[in-house]
């Protein structure tokens, strides 16, 4: 990292987080139902270095501390033997004493039907309680509405974590959005992003998330911050000595004129080195290519065709002015 600290926690030093932030990186909400009693009612500033209110996750408001737990904020999962939206109902009583639902043929118990609080209709960690007609949400501080769906938080509350910038609406009390620094996401910039999981590097580039920056290591033939530019493999790569550049697979190669070789056709090649003349033919280097002098009984540019005993060849008649056995130039 090019700066003194590897993460935002270090930036805060021993300074106390502003509400509603708590925890080492000031990214968790300290709510009364999930925090030690020393946090007191409502939200309080918490000092990261003292681990004050370094609480478990913010479970659904009202979730039983003895019989419920959560792995995600706003969740309430019950330990074995307990049920209900807040894990306050023992299974033994709930399964047979439910006032709703059809009778079970096997147990004779009433099978609970769907209740108004099932699935928890209250958003943002609100707790649901059944009413004679429907349900009622008790919203945590900062939220309101029938389902706690409306945020009362504004930029003045400092809701953007990890260096996020709060961008408010036209009037000071309107909703906010957080512009998150690279590497963070979520409505409050509270989630660290594995930016490579978004596969930002194109054309087979290798993604490297350096924390403060993202790098793409591009395959040969590609360039740009995201390997988005397909380089013209032959651009600026002239093949020498009359060679022709052939593009392919992010690299270039040269198809060299006879007598030249190497990556850029700069190396002089002996055209006879590969023994191109078949059946014992003799090879001669010529300014315009190689020439094969064929052994008796063979003909062709590389002496590849046998001459039949009656004088006919396996080929159509030799070109005019060329007798079988004459040297033939290989173009």
């Amino acid at each position: 990292y090019p700066y003194d600290v590897p993460d935002y926690a270090g930036m805060l030093g021993s300074a106390r987080c502003e509400p509603p932030a708590v925890g080492t990186a000031c990214t968790r909400l300290c709510r009364p139902r999930s925090a030690p009693s020393r946090c007191g009612p409502g939200l309080r500033p918490c000092a990261p270095l003292e681990d004050e209110c370094e609480a478990p996750l913010v479970c659904r408001a009202g979730c039983s501390p003895e019989h419920g737990f959560c792995e995600q904020p706003g969740e309430c999962r019950c330990l074995e033997g307990w049920t209900g939206p807040l894990c306050t109902v023992p299974v033994s009583t709930s399964s047979c004493l439910s006032p709703r639902g059809p009778s079970s043929a096997t147990t004779g118990c009433l099978v609970p039907g769907p209740g108004p609080c099932d699935g928890n209709p209250c958003a943002n960690g609100g707790s649901c309680s059944e009413t004679p007609r429907s349900f009622e949400c008790t919203c945590p501080r900062g939220f309101y509405g029938l389902r706690c769906e409306v945020s009362g938080v504004t930029c003045a509350d400092g809701p953007c974590f990890n260096g996020g910038l709060c961008v408010g609406g036209a009037d000071p009390d309107s909703a906010y959005i957080c512009h998150c620094p690279p590497g963070f996401q979520g409505s409050n910039c509270e989630k660290r992003v594995d930016r490579c999981s978004l596969q930002p590097c194109r054309n087979g580039g290798l993604c490297l998330d350096l924390g403060h920056a993202l790098r793409c290591r591009c395959r040969a033939g590609f360039a740009g911050p995201r390997c988005e530019h397909d380089l013209d493999d032959c651009a600026g790569r002239a093949c020498a000595n009359g060679g022709t550049c052939v593009e392919g697979g992010g690299a270039h190669r040269c198809s060299c004129a006879l007598g030249f070789g190497g990556r850029d056709c700069r190396e002089r090649a002996d055209p006879c080195a590969a023994r191109p003349c078949a059946h014992g033919g003799r090879c001669y280097a010529h300014f315009s290519g190689l020439v094969c002098a064929c052994a008796p009984g063979y003909m062709g540019a590389r002496c590849e065709f046998p001459v039949h005993p009656d004088g006919a060849s396996a080929l159509p008649a030799a070109p005019p002015g060329l007798r079988p056995g004459d040297p033939q130039r290989y173009l």
Epitope: Y8, G158, C160, L165, C166
Partner: antibody, heavy 118, light 108 residues
């Protein structure tokens, strides 16, 4: 260390559009937010706008109706356009990189002076 | 918008002395998202402090920042000749990003 270089005309006529470009010396343009800040002669600093390669932009409300910021990753450049300029827009214009731990500015260009005169 | 007021406007001190610069915000600066910059004549500003108290890379430890809420301070423990410049604070908690008017530290 990455370097930023502003370019554009040093003289703009009143009511015309000021266009400036900032070239980033390396391929980090997709890794950071990029911003424009200006400083009238003998005065303080004023933030104008910032942009991220994802398309996120944010403008100073006092200039929003006249400002456009854009970014070209292929050229490692981002640009500023300020329309209907007046003498009050004469300033040194800086391009800057937004710090990765918040919206402060850790790398600055050397600045380009823009004069508004007919 | 959050208005930042810097004081004093000018500070006349001698090399080796301690400089204390103040930056006061019209509203609370959330999460101590406040930075300090140094600007020498004819040059671009340079980031000194971010997060109210963390030094940027390469900044000597004679520079320190403190404060939270609405009151912030930049302290230069022993002024060196190259420290005589203009200093700006900037908040980056709430848009629009705003700068203070600056404090000029001059040689007495």
């Amino acid at each position: 260390q990455v370097q930023l270089q502003e370019s554009g005309p040093g003289l703009v006529k009143p009511s015309e559009t000021l266009s400036l470009t900032c070239t980033v010396s390396d391929n980090s343009i997709s890794n950071y937010y990029w911003s424009w800040i200006r400083q009238p002669p003998g005065k303080g600093l004023e933030w104008i706008a910032y942009i991220y390669y994802s398309g996120t932009t944010n403008y100073n409300p006092s200039l929003k109706s006249r400002v456009t910021i854009s970014l070209d990753t292929s050229k490692n450049q981002f640009s500023l356009q300020l329309s209907s300029v007046t003498a009050a827009d004469a300033a040194v214009y800086y391009c800057a990189r937004v710090f990765h731990w918040g919206f402060a500015f850790d790398i600055w260009g050397q600045g380009t002076m823009v004069t508004v005169s007919s | 918008e959050i208005v930042l007021t810097q004081s004093p406007g000018t500070l006349s001190l001698s090399p080796g002395e301690r400089a204390t610069l103040s930056c006061r915000a019209s509203q609370r600066v959330s999460n101590t998202y406040l930075a300090w910059y140094q600007q020498n004549p004819g040059q671009a500003p340079r980031l000194l402090i971010y997060g109210a108290s963390s030094r940027a890379t390469g900044i000597p430890d004679r520079f320190s920042g403190s404060g939270s809420g609405t009151d912030f301070t930049l302290t230069i423990s022993r002024l060196e000749p190259e420290d005589f410049a203009v200093y700006y604070c900037q908040q980056y908690g709430t848009s629009p990003l705003t700068f203070g008017g600056g404090t000029k530290v001059e040689i007495k």
